[in-house]
């Protein structure tokens, strides 16, 4: 091995300046006893190498690239060998950013899977291999003093979410919680969160369901439905309130939403709609008075609107 | 400090009738659920019935089905059992509790003994 | 209905002893998996909610593990007043099912 490249850092911020010294010791007898050192970046002969013959014999040559603006080039050191170039030593120069602080982070409990899942906006791109970590740990207060540290979570590549499972929560307790990013060039954290992972549940939607007729009760009126809902059953004991929407099933017309509902109504007369009309219906659900999520909207039902007895189908579409 | 307190147990004849009620304290009664569970001489526990924090859903075991009603106060923060048509094999010790919200229960009151025997 | 089977039914253990007790669901029941401990002529204490949570005011040497179908309440080391009965209890679902306890008892 003839020649070795130095560079004063192989990582640059985008647009910067970089120096390198390739070195071509004296026993490559076989080369011109003063060869000329030249300097390629990517396909392109770079002019301004200043050359040296050093005390110990070897040959130097120094060059300054005023501007990386190359995201990934190889540079490298050649001298011309007959009518060829000879490359002697070559490295790999990066250019990027560091990472901006990741934003938007928001955490959600699930308690079928039973972890908390957290994403976040990564910010721009930094052209860099760049990792994100969230971190954590429990508090017992407002996370102003830290407790046990939680494992930290690495998310799959090019993922901005990442699942904390239950072994590491503690429900009904604080939690402090933020990303940090970090490339070559530096690191960077996200604002903290601190929450209490019950505070951030989101629940599985009730089941909507027509209301079975019975002999005693009335039909519904013209341009009314009767529904019912089957709540999801893991949640039963989380107090909730509800909220329904329906649209008619043709045309144009957008969603109107009826709420607040208590889960526990558990059924309903929607009145107020056009008499013999196929509408469609969801509902869904957030705790409440405490905090939380909405839950998803429902599968949706289909009924119509009749001056008889109504007529219904089920109709399940899952977003 | 949470305080549940039951009474009205004590010896009925099978075919009888009898009323627990459970005293809550030290928590705002009407945003919990509440239960009763209870246990034969010497045996395990048993889910017997619970109720929603106002009172709109009221899910009971098989083996009280058509027999018991749980019930609650909101106003005067009591959960109440009415139980008919006892049984001998409703004798035990009933306890009511408060439901967390993911269903468990915590804390206990000290529980009530129902004897049903002639 | 979901049956709740514990395992073993009861157990001698000497103080200082790490004692595990197992709980199985009939079917899947995610974390909703709570455990209590009963002393003779009290009310149950509830010990871990959730699977693994302890309970307020509970010693850390009892800690629970599982989900799905297969629970472990553990002591890590048994001190006098542990000797009790122990119940889980699963949550999923309504009929609320307690399993058939576990005595521990002194060696």
């Known amino acids: 091995e003839c020649g070795h490249i130095s560079v004063s850092a192989p990582i640059v911020h985008l647009g910067d300046p970089i120096t390198a010294s390739c070195i071509i010791k004296q026993n490559c007898s076989h080369l011109d006893p003063e060869p000329q050192i030249l300097w390629r970046l990517g396909a392109e002969l770079q002019p301004g190498g200043r050359q040296q013959r050093l005390s110990d014999g070897t040959q130097e040559s120094i060059i300054t690239l005023p501007h990386l603006n190359h995201t990934q080039a190889f540079l490298s050191c050649a001298l011309n060998w007959g009518n060829s170039l000879q490359i002697l030593d070559q490295v790999e120069l990066r250019a990027g950013y560091p990472p901006a602080i990741p934003h938007n982070l928001s955490c959600l409990m699930n308690l079928t899977t039973s972890s908390l899942i957290c994403q976040w906006e990564p910010g721009p791109e930094t052209h860099l291999p760049t990792s994100f970590t969230l971190k954590s740990f429990k508090s017992r207060g407002n996370c102003q003093t830290q407790g046990d540290s939680i494992l930290d979570c690495v998310p799959k590549d090019g993922q901005s979410h990442c699942s904390i499972p239950r072994k590491h929560l503690l429900l009904y307790q604080n939690m402090g919680i933020w990303v940090q990013a970090e490339n070559a060039l530096g690191t960077s954290m996200s604002p903290q969160l601190c929450l209490d992972p019950m505070d951030v549940v989101k629940l599985e939607p009730p089941m909507l369901r027509t209301m079975d007729p019975s002999p005693e009760a009335a039909p519904p009126q013209a341009g009314c439905l009767q529904l019912s809902w089957e709540p999801w059953q893991p949640g039963l004991h989380i107090n909730q309130k509800c909220e329904l929407r329906h649209k008619p099933q043709r045309g144009e017309a957008s969603w109107a939403l009826v709420g607040p509902l208590p889960l526990e109504a558990l059924q309903y007369e929607l009145c107020g709609l056009l008499p013999a009309t196929a509408y469609t219906l969801q509902i869904r659900c957030i705790r409440w008075p405490l905090p939380g999520h909405w839950s998803d909207w429902s599968p949706s039902l289909e009924l119509r609107t009749t001056e008889r007895a109504p007529t219904h189908h089920h109709h399940h579409h899952h977003h | 400090e949470v305080q549940l307190l039951e009474s009205g147990g004590g010896l009925v004849q099978p075919g009888g009738s009898l009323r627990l009620s459970c005293a809550a304290s030290?928590?705002?009664?009407?945003?919990?659920?509440m239960g009763w569970v209870r246990q034969a001489p010497g045996k395990g526990l048993e889910w017997v019935s619970s109720i929603s924090s106002s009172g709109g859903v009221t899910p009971y075991a098989d083996s009280v089905k058509g027999r018991f009603t749980i019930s609650r106060d909101n106003s005067k923060n009591t959960l109440y059992l009415q139980m008919n048509s006892l049984r001998a094999e409703d004798t035990a010790v009933y306890y009511c509790a408060k439901l967390g919200e993911l269903g468990w229960f915590d804390p206990w009151g000290q529980g009530t003994l129902v004897t049903v025997s002639s | 209905d979901i049956q709740m089977t514990q395992s073993p039914s009861s157990l001698s253990a000497s103080v200082g002893d790490r004692v595990t007790i197992t709980c199985r669901a009939s079917?899947?029941?995610?974390?909703?998996l709570n455990w209590y401990q009963q002393k003779p002529g009290k009310a149950p204490k509830l010990l871990i909610y959730?699977?693994?949570n302890l309970q307020n005011g509970v010693p850390s040497r009892f800690s629970g593990s599982g989900s799905g179908t297969d629970f472990t309440l553990t002591i890590s080391s048994l001190q006098p007043e542990d000797f009790a009965t122990y119940y889980c209890q699963q949550s999923w679902e309504y009929p609320l099912v307690f399993g058939g306890g576990t005595k521990v008892e002194i060696k």
């Open positions: 079917q899947g029941i995610s974390s909703y």
């Open positions: 959730y699977a693994s």
């Open positions: 030290g928590f705002t009664f009407s945003l919990y659920w």
